[in-house]
């Protein structure tokens, strides 16, 4: 299990910027416009534009309320007029440089509209949002805009019983079959497009990946066994001519594995996914947050998957097929029969074109019938190193974003920002042999779940934005200035931070910073370069005989142990003479002349089997 976060920042301790509007709730849709330095926020019955550099500065707002008539009709169907029968913004996607595509639940009558960014007004198009946005604000959803077409995963009907992955397109709309083997009570988590690799084979297609958790069809248990999935469709899909007409011909899905090797610990509920794309990476990496299905202990894990691993399952893996054996417990088994050509579920690539299959519309019926009946792959997608990057106890992770940053020595590190269901943000760096949880920041005053996380990755200014029911919080990627000494700065093992001996401060590293000469940073936590020992100041105290003295010591690191020394000997709390307050401050009882002298408070922190010792406080005590 990962260690506790080294540092804990309370809500008011660090520089967080907040945005919320009284009476507005459910700030669950965030969209960044890097070029405009604007963050768009979709909430209940409202959309806001705020300054991305300081989100407390509101630029625009527009309200999208439900009429009383609609509310009443919704309430007649058994829904709550005060909560469910409102308009929850669920889709907030860029349409052009001057407009956004926005969809809301609209009192169980999902509706979409275009938001003009110049006037910040809706155009009043009121398109049917069915299949693009859920009816029920409690139902899962995901969407991504690809080339002006919305790809969505949501529920298609009022009851929420009909799942759908669709492409909303004027010339070639597509959807999944409404069939249990295709989607079985899915909970949609994330969708994104992966563009064809520039060095990949000619004529490749862009692909859209959907991540969700669904009820297993391949295993039967006494309870509903949930399975995390990745599904994939091709951007160039146009459906079939007869079989799979206006349906995906490229829809395939596979199981995501995230488990601790040689243990029964299986993480099968997908919470969130982030696609890491970075100049130094040869291919995108999917980072995913999981929790176990029976999570009575509060466990969470992060697994990472390479695009190549995912692609290999879809392009070369075996398929599963429904077993019609009566009383069979494994209803789905590996299909070992002949696979039609072209390969079912494959995108139309140069190979297919060479065989005269220029579009999915002229794929042979055998291929289409096969993919219709075999949407599930037998092979599973395994994580990098076949194990989670991080397993954390006593926490329920909700969302993740990942930044790849360069340390002072030129090494690249993946830094994960993972939110919790109690309003906190954990920041963890992936080191060679371990994951170091740098810090935990309480983003929200109340312990409320973080609903959405967004990373702004503009060079020179990077922020994490978190949305919850009550508002949005903007946090810098690091609080370097909070590390008061060189040792603290280095022990943080934060790739964004380095100690500047010139100004005797822990500073934020900017990739384009030129004047970083002489700065100190060591990702192994080696503080031996910290030469400028801070000037030793001390506190002088005078106490009366027989009294009790309390000597303060402030230690921030959760990984360090506080040690008190008197006349160079370590003081133990077991003695009736001494007591500790909060494992930090020292109490000395029944004072006598022998208690006069110098008391030192030190912090001892083990980093990579080495103990780093720091003097935190020095007290000179005189008993009169």
């Amino acid at each position: 299990f990962a260690p506790v976060p080294r540092l804990t920042w309370e809500h008011g301790e660090v520089g967080l910027v907040q945005f919320h509007k009284p009476g507005i709730f459910n700030y669950s849709a965030l969209l960044m416009s890097e070029d405009k330095d604007t963050l768009y926020v979709g909430a209940r019955e409202a959309v806001f534009a705020v300054n991305a550099l300081n989100i407390s500065e509101k630029q625009h707002e527009v309200y999208w309320k439900v009429s009383e008539d609609k509310k009443s009709k919704c309430a007649e169907k058994g829904k709550s007029k005060q909560t469910e029968c409102l308009n929850y913004i669920r889709v907030l996607q860029p349409l052009s440089s001057t407009s956004l595509y926005v969809c809301g639940t609209n009192a169980f009558q999902p509706t979409c509209d275009h938001l003009n960014l110049t006037s910040f007004k809706f155009l009043g198009k009121s398109e049917d949002g069915k299949g693009r946005c859920p009816f029920d604000p409690a139902h899962s959803y995901t969407s991504v805009m690809v080339g002006g077409e919305l790809y969505s995963g949501t529920s298609y009907n009022f009851l929420g019983s009909e799942p759908i992955i669709s492409r909303n397109s004027s010339h070639s709309p597509l959807r999944t079959e409404y069939a249990i083997p295709w989607l079985n009570e899915p909970s949609f988590v994330f969708a994104d497009v992966i563009q064809k690799s520039p060095d990949g084979p000619e004529g490749e297609d862009d692909k859209v990946y959907f991540f969700f958790t669904e009820v297993s069809v391949e295993y039967e248990f006494v309870f509903k066994l949930m399975i995390p999935r990745v599904a994939r469709v091709c951007k160039g899909d146009q459906g079939g001519l007869r079989t799979l007409q206006k349906k995906w011909t490229s829809f395939l899905k596979a199981r995501l594995i995230c488990s601790k090797p040689d243990s029964g610990l299986v993480f099968n509920i997908l919470q969130d996914v982030f696609v890491l794309r970075a100049p130094g990476l040869k291919e995108p990496v999917f980072y995913a947050v999981f929790t176990p299905q029976l999570n009575n202990v509060g466990l969470s894990a992060v697994c990472a998957y390479t695009l190549a691993t995912v692609e290999a399952v879809f392009s070369r893996g075996k398929y599963m097929q429904s077993a019609t054996v009566e009383q069979s417990h494994t209803k789905w088994v590996r299909y070992n029969g002949p696979v039609p050509t072209p390969r079912p579920g494959a995108c139309i690539d140069s190979e297919a074109r060479a065989a005269n299959y220029t579009s999915s519309l002229n794929l042979p019926d055998k291929t289409l019938q096969f993919v219709k009946d075999h949407p599930l792959m037998d092979d599973s997608v395994t994580p990098i190193d076949n194990r989670p990057k991080l397993i954390k106890k006593d926490v329920n992770y909700t969302q993740i974003v990942v930044d790849r940053t360069q340390a002072l020595d030129g090494t690249f590190y993946d830094v994960m920002f993972i939110s919790t269901d109690r309003g906190a943000l954990h920041k963890a760096v992936i080191l060679t042999k371990e994951v170091h949880v740098i810090e935990e920041t309480q983003l929200f005053r109340d312990s409320e779940p973080v609903l959405t996380l967004l990373l702004s990755s503009k060079k020179g200014r990077k922020f994490v934005y978190a949305g919850s029911n009550s508002g949005v919080v903007q946090a810098p990627l690091a609080f370097c200035e909070k590390h008061g000494s060189c040792e603290d700065c280095v022990l943080a093992r934060d790739p964004y931070c380095a100690w500047s001996p010139a100004i005797k401060a822990c500073v934020t590293l900017h990739q384009e910073e030129a004047s970083s000469r002489g700065w100190i940073q060591d990702m192994s936590g080696d503080t031996s370069s910290c030469l400028d020992k801070s000037k030793e100041s001390f506190n002088q105290h005078f106490f009366k005989h027989g009294g009790t003295a309390e000597l303060k010591c402030f230690q921030k690191s959760n990984l360090a142990r506080v040690v008190w020394k008197f006349q160079n000997g370590e003081l133990k709390a077991a003695s009736p003479k001494y007591g500790f307050v909060g494992r930090k401050h020292l109490l000395i009882f029944n004072l006598s002349d022998g208690d006069s002298g110098v008391y030192q408070c030190l912090s001892e922190e083990r980093v990579r089997n080495k103990t780093v010792s720091q003097l935190l406080a020095k007290h000179v005590l005189e008993v009169k």
Epitope: K130, G131, Y156, N157, F158, L159, S161, E162, S166, N168, P173, L174, R175, E177, Y178, A179, I180, P181, N184, E185, V215, V217, K224, K246, S322, A323, T324, K331, K372
Partner: antibody, heavy 118, light 111 residues
């Protein structure tokens, strides 16, 4: 071949309950949603609700919420519909029907007549 | 709920003649170019039988004298040449939006 065989006719007293069964054969039971439709004497067809046999997740027409309970037993490939607090207006023929990919009822049970009379 | 209204309520057509039944939905039953409208035939003492799905697709095993057309809110079932065995009640049904609803039925008889 694909078949849905329903239980026999029932005569029930007002206030009582009845459980109608629908046994599927000739196809993979868990791969298709099962729906229930009712037809009152001399009347048209009314959709009551559906069930996902894999998960047991049922959803109902608002009109029949609290009246009908749909369940499945995967081990016997059987769907059930229980009607509670029976009244004379519940007298009808009840059909189970398989919901196919194209969003239509392609196979129907033969129907079960439930008569509610004192 | 979407209300389906069939016309006429009953229809008498001579053998070999064309029979046309209309169905009007209170709101569109289309989604992204697909019409979720189905037609069923029910004979006395029997369950309904699927004839046409998705407005115009003929169910396998159904004679090709049956055809369906229409989109949006207006749909038609046509029997090109009525046969004696076609005497039955015909129902339209939408599956675009729950609750799924049926028309009141059209009784087709021989003139």
């Amino acid at each position: 071949q694909v078949q849905l065989v329903q239980s026999g006719a029932e005569v029930k007293k007002p206030g009582s309950s009845v459980k109608v069964s629908c046994k599927a054969s000739g196809y993979s039971f868990s791969d298709y949603y099962m729906h229930w439709v009712r037809q009152a004497p001399g009347q048209g067809l009314e959709w009551m609700g559906q069930i996902n046999p894999t998960t047991g997740g049922a959803s109902y027409n608002q009109k029949f919420k609290g009246k009908a309970t749909i369940t499945v037993d995967k081990s016997t490939s059987t769907a059930y519909m229980e009607l509670s607090s029976l009244r004379s207006e519940d007298t009808a023929v009840y059909y189970c029907a398989r919901y196919y990919y194209g969003r239509h009822f392609d196979v129907w049970g033969q129907g079960t007549t439930v008569t509610v009379s004192s | 709920d979407i209300v389906m209204t069939q016309s006429p309520d009953s229809l008498a057509v001579s053998l070999g003649e064309r029979a046309t039944i209309n169905c009007k939905a209170s709101q569109s039953v289309d989604y992204d170019g697909d019409s979720y409208m189905n037609w069923y035939q029910q004979k006395p003492g029997q369950p309904p039988k699927l004839l046409i799905y998705a407005a115009s697709n003929l169910e396998s095993g159904v004679p090709d004298r049956f055809s369906g057309s229409g989109s949006g809110t207006d749909f038609t079932l046509t029997i090109s040449s009525l046969q004696a065995e076609d005497v039955a009640v015909y129902y339209c049904q939408q599956s675009n939006e729950d609750p799924y609803t049926f028309g009141q039925g059209t009784k087709l008889e021989i003139k």
